[in-house]
Structure formats: C-alpha cells, structure tokens
Interface confidence: low
Amino acid sequence: TQNKALPENVKYGIVLDAGSSHTSLYIYKWPAEKENDTGVVHQVEECRVKGPGISKFVQKVNEIGIYLTDCMERAREVIPRSQHQETPVYLGATAGMRLLRMESEELADRVLDVVERSLSNYPFDFQGARIITGQEEGAYGWITINYLLGKFSQKTRWFSIVPYETNNQETFGALDLGGASTQVTFVPQNQTIESPDNALQFRLYGKDYNVYTHSFLCYGKDQALWQKLAKDIQVASNEILRDPCFHPGYKKVVNVSDLYKTPCTKRFEMTLPFQQFEIQGIGNYQQCHQSILELFNTSYCPYSQCAFNGIFLPPLQGDFGAFSAFYFVMKFLNLTSEKVSQEKVTEMMKKFCAQPWEEIKTSYAGVKEKYLSEYCFSGTYILSLLLQGYHFTADSWEHIHFIGKIQGSDAGWTLGYMLNLTNMIPAEQPLSTPLSHSTYV
C-alpha cells in the first residue's frame, strides 16, 4: 500500500514586538514532538503594523484596536483555524513604553490595558502584554541568536549549517539597537561581572552560562538624536542649528515642545527664547562624531572598566551578532559585508554625510525623506557607540557580524522570549530517543 502522509503535527506561537517606533508581529512554527530540541523553531511570517509605536497612542488609546487589526487578521489567515485556540500570543513592549512608564505609570498601564483588551478578542491563547525589562531584552536577544546559530545544540558539528558559524560552541555576543535603547549581551572570558545588575545566570540544555548584559535607555538611535539636538541647541546663538549630522542643504523645523517631550532630553532642558528652531545640515562626519561623543560620559567609572555613564563593561570576548537597527542602517549604507574594515566604514560614512541633500534625495527616490535624512546621523552614531561606547577597535571590528536573519528567522528578542515563555529551552539536556516519531505510516 502507498504511504500516506499524516496531518502535520505542528505548533505555532505569536509574539508582538511593541517597539518605540513601530510594532511587528512574528509568527513561529515548530514540530510538536520536538519541542525540546534546539533549533527547530522557525519564523514563518513577519507583519509590520502600520503606524508608530504603541506609546504614541497615549492620547488616543481607542485607536489601538484598529491599529493591531491588520496584522492580527494576517495571523488568523496564516495559522490553521484548528490551531487558533492553542496558539499563544505574547506582546512585549520595550524602551518606548519604559520611557512612557517613567513619565506616568498610569498612562503606560492604560495603553497596556487597551492592548490586552484588543488582543483578547482574537481566537488565540492570549498570554498577556507587558513591558519587558532592558535586561530581558538583552537576554532574549542573546538566546535568540545563539539558538538560531545552533550554539546550544548537544553535539559540535564538523560542517557548517548556518552563516557566521565558527564550528564551536562558543556563544555569540548580541548587540541590539532600537529606537529608544540599545543592548549589549555576551559571555565574558573568566571575568567576574562586577555589577550584579548586569549579571545573568542561565542553565540551558545542561550547560551553565554566566552572561553580562546591559540596556542603555535613551541610547537607541532616535532618542540619541533627540539627546544630541537638545544638547546642541543649548549653545546655539539663535534659532538656527547648523548640524554636521545632516546632509548639506537639508533643512527641518523642530518644535522645542517635541524636543523636551521625552525623558531622555531632561538633562539638557533649558528655557529657550524661541518655540521652534531650524536644523540646517552641514554634512561633516568628523564633527558629527565629536558631537555624539559628548553624549557618552566616560569621565566616571566605579569599576575596573566601563562602557559609558559609569556602567560596568567587561573586556569584549568572541564574535558578536549586531542586529535590529545596527543591521538595517548598515544594510542601507551597504556596509554589512564581512570584508569591510572599520577604517573603510569610516571612510564611506565621511563621503555619505558630505553628499548634498538634493543629490541624496535623487539617488534614493523610493525612501521616505524622514528616514533618509537620518542615515548620516544613524551610521555615525553606530560607529561612535561601537568604538567609543563599547570599546571595539579596528582589529576587533571583524568580530562584529551585522545580521538581519539567521536561517530565515529575524534576529531579535522575540524568538528567545517565546522559547522561554513556552518552556522550550530546557535547563537540562533532553534525553535523546533513538528514533523520532515518523510522519509516514
């Protein structure tokens, strides 16, 4: 008799990443009988929600339901109806909501309450919406990339199945850049983690990991730009801000009220004799870099060594995956290749920032001007953060791998979050069975 395929025994999970600038929904899928195996979960869909991040809905919470509809309906289509009720849905909000919570816990709670109420109306197994900590964001990003790279697998392989694989079980560090925060997470080499707040202990697949992590709130690319503008307008002689981080010929009017809306600019706030000012781009990488460095306080360190702002950072160790905005920005600038040295990246940034705005607009006609205008700042900021902030050097630059996806799944905290919340990363090594369940009879 002919072999007949049994119905696919798979499970699904949904995670919404409620970031500061936008929300993305990820759908994951895995074979039901292999839940504890490493590397079996993969992403089948990403849906980017149209509109800003959820923290921007604080004055219009009634619009959140409509905002989430398209992507939740997409999930309804992708996941078979028979699986809906057992598919967990998690929403994790990151630094945009951490900032809102700093301003008002009540407002943050109201936003989350409406989000929870909206998501509860779908036929999935809604598990809650919460603001994840910076420490969790770093930890889950680290878990995600190492899970996808096969670093937790039982056996070392003599062949490579994924890019960036170094054929050993040394984990990769994780560098995550968002709009409002940035995370650095890695296993230091025989180094005491001097600050308990930055120490994580994991037991995964029978192995112990002592992991360093820190999340720098206000040092995501968007909030760093607001910080820089607030700092620079303090010393402007009038309502014109000649800014080296924008292309020559670029002009934009900024409301002072918008500048001081975020808690990230509070330290630079002052009474200005104008309600608006105009940014006028002058496109100078070196000056832009110098201005950015003023955001990092490196004069104070209560530990053996620090990143900046008095935050402990052990000596860098091993390879790093740099993802989220680290990847998107460098990809746009065509600087993600492993072959491009740090010196070459700097050289190319100098040329890019110096290009006139009109020329840039013509060259990248399909890109929204809001985003296009900020690539000079973002690229310079990435270099400043990695080199001066985290102490990468021209030599260690080659250990940074700019990663968008690994094996078809986005690098980021969402997969690690789901793996943890669905108990799919066992602390102990699962007992291996001689044969997996056959899918054919």
Epitope: G128, A139, R203, N420, N423
Partner: nanobody
C-alpha cells in the same frame, strides 16, 4: 485550583539568613511563573522576586538584588526563596503566588493563586 503553602519563616537577627519554601498542590506547577511578595504592617503588598516557568529568567526588586535568590524544583513542585544578609526592613509577611499568564509579574494583580503567607521578622 492551585493551592500554595509557604513555610520557613521565623525570627532572625540582622545579617542572618532564611530559606522560604512554597509548595504547590498541583503537578502542573512548573507551567506557572512564581512570585514572592511581602507586606509590612500598614503597607501595600510589594513585589520581591519572580521566576519564569522555565527558570531561565528571574526578576528581583532593587531592594533585594544580590541578597535574595529564587529557585525552583519542578520535581518537588516547590519554589524557594533564599534570603541572605537580612535587614530589619525585610520584616514582613511573605506571600508566594502563582502566575499562569506570564504577564504583569511585578504587581499582585498579575497572579492567579496565593498562599496564606509566612512571617519573617528581622531583629536589630
């Protein structure tokens, strides 16, 4: 219905240690997040520490970081709170709670099931 029973409280001098246990009536306890809260006289119930279902990530209140450690033994359906370097301000009634929703770990309303509490008194 998960029933939780705390034990291990008592009177201890400042600088001393205690280990609280929270035993659950149900075998599916390892599917729940576990939190410890404390309530001092005249004060609201306050978050102390939580552990996620898999035990991979733990969360601590700033006031206990580096002094308290949460762990769990799934085989025994028990969660533990090891409290070192105790201070008089740690004096409170300590509650264990189970969270089936993996959300809102830091506030009491995120938890579905509660124990009756065990008293911890730290004398100076």
């Amino acid at each position: 219905q998960v029933k939780l029973q705390e034990s291990g409280g008592g009177l201890v001098q400042a600088g001393g240690s205690l280990r609280l246990s929270c035993t659950a009536s149900e075998e599916s306890f390892n599917k729940y997040g576990v939190g410890w809260f404390r309530q001092a006289p005249g004060k609201e119930r306050a978050f102390v520490v939580a552990i996620r279902p898999s035990g991979v990530i733990t969360s601590y209140a700033d006031s206990v970081k580096g002094r308290f450690t949460i762990s769990r033994d799934s085989a025994k359906n028990t969660a533990y709170l090891q409290m070192n370097s105790l201070k008089p301000e740690d004096t409170a009634l300590y509650y264990c709670a189970a969270n089936s929703r993996n959300t809102n770990y830091y506030r009491p309303n995120g938890y579905d099931y509660w124990g009756r509490g065990t008293q911890v008194t730290v004398s100076s």
